[in-house]
């Protein structure tokens, strides 16, 4: 199984001497180290605990441990002029302003650089007028708004509720729907679950607790100023008005206590239906603006924040392979944070910290992985995933070449229920057959595998007996290497029971109170799932970085590209009428979809009966499944947006957290019965189903035996 | 009706002890953080500590942290303060106080205990 | 930690004044205010909380107004019985500090 040339350790305990090395008191002891103040991007602080990652590392035994810095735009209110919303009477005067801050958790009091609750890149504004109610101000919120209720949000401030959709889908929407202001609000329908108490009594979102975020719309592109390359000493800027992504309209999030303020005033039309009730005790009119005897009041958004080019430090080690050293397995995650990290990302950064001391014990005994492992800590993912963009874009063409895989390390946890994965197709069967060597730390699974366990609490739903495995969407580190390189990727976490638990993400989320004692107290008081992970993303990095054959397997996309094409033929065929009409037919990708199905079975066979004692022959096979994810990647990208170039995966234009399968085409087809000239816009779903046959029957073509 | 009585005050010299209690009813007990505050003869209110919902975490004044220790048996709807190596400045009426949450105002308050610390 | 500020220390006034009492937080509070009052050998009992919100059972002859570091409590028209100390508290992180009291005599 994984065996390696340059070890003085017996080839089968290689991966048993790693897990076992795993330590849940010192992830525990990592957590707490890196928790104790705040990390945010761009800050002293954050390059202080870059240089002391650094050194750690080097002290774990990594053979080199660099520095890597770029000079991006980031965003900060500004100190002495802070962000807040008030209601203004006739008269203009100020008769509720929302909170500044923030109550400090217990213990926290006397912490100073506590960054206020603000949304990032929020242009500066003083916008009043009307309130509008969108809901989570989705497309198809807006949808509802504007053509079944006739509610026009032009020239409106409008206030979201946080969930369902990342933030920056958000703002575009509004936008885009004429918005002068966006107000965020976490509803404790989404951040309340019935029976938790609040922070710091439980792992429930209080009153005052604010979501801070980034709100850009970059598409992949990494430093706002500087797209398709590094933001390094010498680097070209675009100005402020070319930068790539940043919103145009001031936005602001609150807490639920301030929210309740702004809502209960609020008449116009009364909410469509009962999906667009939160939990506060208001009516969630819909407005436009306030009822009776509030009407002549309105709200005014007060946002000077600025945006500022800073400093940003990646700390990349390198632990060098002994038989492929230009072969790379990347293990990254992020170290910047919104306050103190509990969960993001210090949760993810103190696995991370644990695996390298592992791999170093390891290299310490005289061991050396087959391939060169990189070990990467990410800075300003908070920003728009700046550090890990810019790194990929400044070492692309070494990627491109070299880059096995990418495993990302963000937050461990967002609940103790399960294990939760997302990641390429090629990676199915290396996840089903590590989860099924390892325990399952679950209550009643005692003495089981955590691959029963997550089976039994997450069900695939295609296949019975196996666990649930989701598409990559973006919002995270994996992003540049996936969605831009084409390099395969995953990620791991435990969660949450998605069953009972309808809030969106974890309720503290990017809030103050994400401190070390919400981990440790509430999520995971003997850091067994944390040691899980740790187990899953580590042993995942060992197999990828040691395995004599890669351990992917391309039968596992065959399966998911039938599935996709099935799917995307089925929406396509909501429009019977109109396929006949523009002559829409999908039989070239499910033609491809067959050949690639074929030509993978037979590479497979392949696989099974080559020479492994060949270097030459098995570069070659280890070369096709390197590349496959690559031969994915359309050099043109997608419409609109160049740095998504995976034609099969994107993050969702409605969602960046949700991936998409055959983004190209899903987008020709959205909406579709809308369109102004349905004979383009049916053009252009016949030219995506050419890309995407194109792209499959290449890919599979890669596969095909060399001569 | 919310009721919250208080007991064990008197007199105690430097360096004793004392132990007071509180008994509640009229509330559902463990659904309320619980406090104690004090009140030196002729001057304002200060906060001594406080306890949250099942006794997991506990809040003092910073002075006070080594010497005193709050607790709660929910079982008997009772909160205790023991004080140890009580000094004359320690000498006040302690109230029992209850609220809501972390960040809450005091809506419940017993009638007060006279703790005199005097040789 | 947060000091509260009261004044006056003690005001005279006569039954159907108007009375104003001022609470200055060192730092931001937003609104995470409370007032109460105290009649002699009694227990303070909760008037107003929020900074704004009217407790159970007081009369609406009290108000409260302000955010952030600036709180006032106004007693529209003092009634016989609204002689005593009143209190503001903080509840905005620990240790939740009182202002030091305005006592309100009979002119």
């Known amino acids: 199984k994984s065996s390696n040339e340059a070890t003085n350790i017996t080839p089968k305990h290689n991966m048993k001497a790693f897990l076992d090395e795993l330590k849940a008191e010192n992830i525990k002891k990592f957590l707490y180290n890196f928790t104790q103040i705040p990390h945010l991007a761009g800050t002293e602080q954050n390059f202080q605990l870059a240089k002391q990652i650094q050194s750690q590392w080097k002290e774990f035994g990594l053979d080199s441990v660099e520095l890597a810095h770029y000079d991006v735009l980031l965003s900060y209110p500004n100190k002495t002029h802070p962000n807040y919303i008030s209601i203004i009477n006739e008269d203009g005067n100020e008769i509720f302003n929302t909170s500044l801050f923030e109550p400090p958790p217990p213990g926290y009091e006397n912490v100073s650089d506590i960054v206020p609750p603000f949304s990032a890149f929020s242009p500066q504004g003083m916008p009043e007028g009307d309130l509008v109610y969108v809901n989570y101000a989705r497309t198809e919120d807006f949808f509802k708004l504007e053509r079944d209720m006739k509610i026009n949000c032009s020239g409106k401030i409008v206030i979201a509720r946080y969930g369902k959709v990342f933030r920056g889908n958000k703002v575009k929407n509004a936008q885009l729907a004429g918005a002068k202001g966006v107000i965020l609000y976490s509803d404790p329908a989404d951040y309340f679950a019935p029976g938790v108490k609040s922070y710091p009594d439980g792992w429930n979102l209080p009153g005052g607790g604010v979501q801070r975020g980034n709100i850009l719309n970059l598409n992949g592109a990494g430093d706002p100023l500087t797209p398709g390359y590094p933001a390094n000493e010498y680097a070209y800027r675009r100005g402020i008005a070319e930068a790539v992504g940043l919103p145009s309209i001031p936005v602001h999030p609150i807490g639920y206590y301030d929210a309740q303020k702004l809502l209960e005033k609020m008449g116009g039309s009364a909410p469509p239906d009962s999906s667009w009730r939160g939990s506060l005790k208001v009516p969630y009119n819909v407005g436009p603006g306030f009822t009776g005897n509030f009407s002549t009041q309105k709200v005014k958004m007060h946002i000077h924040s600025t945006n500022e080019v800073t400093r940003i430090y990646n700390v990349i080690g390198t632990l060098r392979g002994a038989v492929e050293p230009d072969r790379y397995v990347i293990l990254g995650g992020h170290r910047d944070s919104w306050v103190f990290g509990g969960i993001d990302p210090q949760s993810g950064a103190a696995v991370v910290h644990e695996i390298v001391r592992s791999f170093g014990t390891l290299k310490k005994e005289g061991w050396r992985p087959r391939r060169t492992i990189l070990f990467a800590s990410w800075d300003a993912e908070e920003f728009g995933l700046l550090g890990s963009t810019e790194w990929a874009e400044e070492n692309s063409r070494l990627l491109q070449e070299r880059g096995v895989a990418y495993i990302n390390a963000d937050s461990s946890i967002e609940g103790n229920y399960t294990l939760r994965v997302d990641c390429t197709p090629l990676m199915y069967s290396l996840v089903h057959n590590l989860t099924k060597e390892l325990k399952s730390p679950d209550e009643g699974f005692e003495g089981k595998s955590l691959y029963e366990s997550w089976t039994k609490k997450s069900p695939s739903p295609e296949f019975s007996g196996m666990p649930r495995i989701s598409k990559l969407g973006s919002g995270n580190d994996f992003e540049v290497f996936f969605q831009r390189l084409g390099i395969a990727s995953g990620r791991a976490r435990y969660t949450k029971n998605w069953e009972t638990n309808k809030f969106s993400g974890y309720p503290l989320y990017h809030s103050v109170y994400e401190t070390y004692e919400l981990v440790e107290k509430f999520y995971d008081p003997m850091f067994k799932y944390h040691l899980t992970v740790a187990q899953v993303r580590g042993g995942m990095v060992f197999e990828l970085a040691n395995s004599i054959v890669l351990p992917f397997d391309c039968r596992d996309y065959a399966v998911v590209l039938r599935k996709y094409a099935d799917k995307i033929y089925s929406i396509s065929m909501k429009h019977p009428q109109e396929m006949k009409t523009y002559s829409v037919s999908f039989d070239s990708l499910f033609s491809a979809v067959k050949n690639f199905t074929e030509i993978a079975s037979k590479f497979s066979e392949r696989l099974q009966d080559f020479d492994k004692s060949n270097p030459i022959v098995l570069r070659m096979m280890n070369d096709q499944l390197m590349f496959l994810e690559r031969a994915f990647i359309d050099p043109l990208g997608l419409p609109d947006r160049p740095f998504y170039r995976h034609v099969i995966y994107a993050p969702s234009s409605h969602n960046k957290y949700a991936g998409e399968s055959f983004p190209g085409i899903y987008d020709a087809l959205f909406d579709i019965e809308s369109k102004v000239d349905p004979s383009k816009a049916w053009g252009e779903v016949k030219r995506q189903i050419y890309v995407a046959a194109f792209t499959v029957q290449a890919a599979a073509e890669t596969l095909s035996e060399v001569a | 009706e919310v009721q919250l009585v208080e007991s064990g005050g008197g007199l105690v010299q430097p360096g004793g002890s004392l132990r007071l209690s509180c008994a509640a009813s009229?509330?559902?007990?463990?659904?309320?953080?619980m406090a104690w505050v004090r009140q030196a003869p002729g001057k304002g209110l200060e906060w001594v500590a406080s306890i949250n919902y099942d006794g997991s975490s506990t809040y003092y004044l910073d002075s006070l942290k080594s010497r005193f220790t709050i607790s709660r048996d929910n079982a008997k709807n009772s909160l205790y303060l023991q004080m140890n190596s009580l000094r004359a400045e320690d000498t006040a009426v302690y109230y029992c106080a209850g609220s809501d949450g972390y960040w809450a105002w005091f809506a419940y308050w017993g009638q007060g205990t006279l703790v005199t610390v005097s040789s | 930690d947060i000091q509260m500020t009261q004044s006056p220390s003690s005001l005279s006034a006569s039954v159907g004044d108007r009375v104003t009492i001022t609470c200055r937080a060192s730092?931001?509070?937003?609104?995470?205010l409370a007032w109460y009052q105290q009649k002699p050998g009694k227990a303070p009992k909760l008037l107003i909380y929020n900074a704004e919100t009217l407790a159970d059972g007081v009369p609406s002859r009290f108000s409260g107004s302000g955010s952030g570091t600036d709180f006032t409590l106004t007693i529209s028209s003092l009634q016989p019985e609204d002689f005593a100390t009143y209190y503001c508290q903080h509840f905005w992180s620990t240790p939740p500090t009182f202002g030091g009291g305005t006592k309100v005599e009979i002119k």
């Open positions: 730092g931001n509070i937003h609104n995470y």
């Open positions: 009229g509330f559902t007990f463990s659904d309320y953080y």
